[in-house]
Amino acid sequence: MMTGTIETTGNISAEKGGSIILQCHLSSTTAQVTQVNWEQQDQLLAICNADLGWHISPSFKDRVAPGPGLGLTLQSLTVNDTGEYFCIYHTYPDGTYTGRIFLEVLESSVAEHGARFQIP
């Protein structure tokens, strides 16, 4: 039975050329996290594997940085980065949990950032 829940940064906005941290947090379960995948629509951005560490997809290696924690930092944002992002937690024995974040990259210098939280 899957009892866990994913908390995310929700809907966020950022300024073109800036950077943003995408974060998810899995709670209410004792399941072991074996891997976290970060995806944009159907495109893999990064993997954080418990044994192998971080992998950043070759096409994003210049603009994506691992962390903080299991989160992901997107840099040098462009308007094309606007869209849905997914954190996919692979756990044992629960299975897979998925969180969704919507990022809007604004041309304006007035970009309102959504609420954030710190993972202890």
Epitope: D51, L52, G53
Partner: nanobody
Framework: EVQLVESGGGLVQPGGSLRLSCAAS????????MGWFRQAPGKERELVAA????????VYADSVKGRFTISADNSKNTAYLQMNSLKPEDTAVYYC?????????WGQGTLVTVSS
């Protein structure tokens, strides 16, 4: 400079199998994991599978899970990718990398074409 040579590609019918090899002039690992990647025409290069240098852990792209198997033989400085139940969408040039996250050296790749 480390040389990587991929081989084993070819033309295969859907449902068929191939075994790719990656031979390195030095250690097949430069980090804690090595990987196989592929690049289809008009698409970005993407991770297919990775294996830790202890061979105790593996990672697979969702699209190949249950069909592909990665392995490595440290004594031969060679890595392998066993590909079963091939699909037309597996058609691509396949590359290996000594570190699944630091793309310092690429081989010339080996072309896999899945077509009837």
């Amino acid at each position: 400079e480390v040389q990587l040579v991929e081989s084993g590609g070819g033309l295969v019918q859907p449902g068929g199998s191939l075994r790719l090899s990656c031979a390195a002039s030095g250690s097949i690992f430069s980090g804690n994991a090595m990987g196989w990647f592929r690049q289809a025409p008009g698409k970005e290069r993407e991770l297919v599978a990775a294996i830790s240098n202890s061979a105790s852990s593996t990672v697979y792209a969702d699209s190949v899970k249950g069909r592909f198997t990665i392995s490595a033989d440290n004594s031969k400085n060679t890595a392998y990718l066993q590909m079963n139940s091939l699909k037309p969408e597996d058609t691509a040039v396949y590359y290996c990398a000594r570190d699944w996250n630091l793309f310092d050296y690429w081989g010339q790749g080996t072309l896999v074409t899945v077509s009837s």
